[in-house]
């Protein structure tokens, strides 16, 4: 039985050219996380964090996607094309798969409404 829940940063906005942290947190379960997959709005895979074999970043994003903090993902040098949905998929044992959604809006303006907790200056 899946007892856990995924908490995410929800809907967030950040400034073009800036950076943002995408964060998901799995709680209320003792299940072991075997792998976390981060996918972009078009369902392309951005990154994998395997419990044994570490982080793997899609080559086209290597220069502007940084692993972490924790199981999160940092997107750098944001462009308008980065606007859209992002999904974290937690593969766990014995529970199974948990999935979280984040919506990122990249803003042209110099002021981006965004929780400081998840924004990198």
């Amino acid at each position: 039985m899946m007892t856990g829940t995924i908490e995410t940063t929800g809907n967030i906005s950040a400034k073009k050219g800036g950076s943002v942290i995408l964060q998901c947190h799995l709680s209320s379960t003792m299940a072991q996380v075997t792998q976390v997959n981060w996918e972009q709005h078009d369902h392309s895979l951005l990154a994998i964090r395997n419990a044994e074999l570490g982080w793997h970043i899609y080559p086209a994003f290597k220069d502007r996607v940084a692993p972490g903090p924790g199981l999160g993902l940092t997107l750098q040098s944001l462009t308008m094309n980065d606007t859209g949905e992002y999904f974290c998929t937690y593969h766990t044992y014995p529970d199974g798969t948990y999935r979280g959604r984040i919506f990122l809006e990249v803003l042209e303006s110099s002021v981006a409404e965004h929780s400081a907790r998840f924004q990198i200056p």
Epitope: Q35, L45, I48, N50, H56, Y58, P59, H91, T97
Partner: antibody
Framework: EVQLVQSGAEVKKPGASVKVSCKAS????????IYWLRQAPGQRLEIMGR????????YFVDKFKNRATITTDTSASTAYMELSSLRSEDTAVYYC??????????WGQGTLVTVSS | DIQLTQSPSFLSASVGDRVTITCKGS??????LVWYQQKPGKAPKLLIY???NLQSGVPSRFSGSGSGTEYTLTISSLQPEDFATYYC????????FGQGTKVEIK
């Protein structure tokens, strides 16, 4: 042209160690992780571990954590895998492979390691 | 980790035949599936990545398809150089390989 060239076949006694080399050419060695995999007779391919030549950081699957060592010599664009305390079940073909994101795009030709008393 | 089961394990075919190999996952593979070809004493060769993308330099007679837990590799017209062992590999949950399908001359 990307190439991974491995060292030759080895015959070892139980309890001994073996060190296999993998020389890379045709690309910037530090830009891709090198994985080591093996295939025992009649078994499927299994991953042993990984090294990031850029920083020397290694990762191992639990099964090999205590017995395998992976190193690189970046000046020679060469990766090494050493497996200790060999037993007969370690008889296998050992492969190095370059990973491109999430899958292996180029492989070495394989090194047969035979463990026999 | 996801377990992959290929079928058949052995396949006898003739030059010109259409050949289909299936790879089934114990869980959803989410299209994160790759196919390799291996000839005796040689390095495995990447054929198809992300279910249906042909690797550069691979002949167009090779194609891949599938979704969820079930995937296929198709060789539209088998050539003499295609007699080999084929492996599927997934990275959706862990990094695992199928047991292989050996394509032999009939």
């Amino acid at each position: 042209e990307v190439q991974l060239v491995q060292s030759g076949a080895e015959v070892k006694k139980p309890g001994a160690s073996v060190k296999v080399s993998c020389k890379a050419s045709g690309y910037t060695f530090t830009e891709h992780s090198i994985y080591w995999l093996r295939q025992a007779p009649g078994q499927r391919l299994e991953i042993m571990g990984r090294i990031d030549p850029k920083n020397g950081r290694t990762y191992f699957v639990d099964k090999f954590k205590n017995r395998a060592t992976i190193t690189t010599d970046t000046s020679a664009s060469t990766a090494y895998m050493e497996l200790s305390s060999l037993r007969s079940e370690d008889t296998a073909v050992y492969y190095c492979a370059r990973i491109d994101g999430f899958y292996f795009d180029f492989w070495g030709q394989g090194t047969l390691v035979t463990v026999s008393s | 980790d996801i377990q992959l089961t290929q079928s058949p394990s052995f396949l006898s075919a003739s030059v010109g035949d259409r050949v289909t190999i299936t790879c089934k996952g114990s869980q959803n593979v989410n299209k994160y599936l790759v196919w390799y070809q291996q000839k005796p004493g040689k390095a495995p060769k990447l054929l198809i990545y992300s279910t249906d993308n042909l690797q550069s330099g691979v002949p167009s007679r090779f194609s891949g398809s599938g979704s969820g837990t079930e995937y296929t590799l198709t060789i539209s017209s088998l050539q003499p150089e295609d007699f080999a062992t084929y492996y599927c590999y997934q990275y959706n949950n862990g990094f695992t390989f199928g047991q292989g399908t050996k394509v032999e001359i009939k």
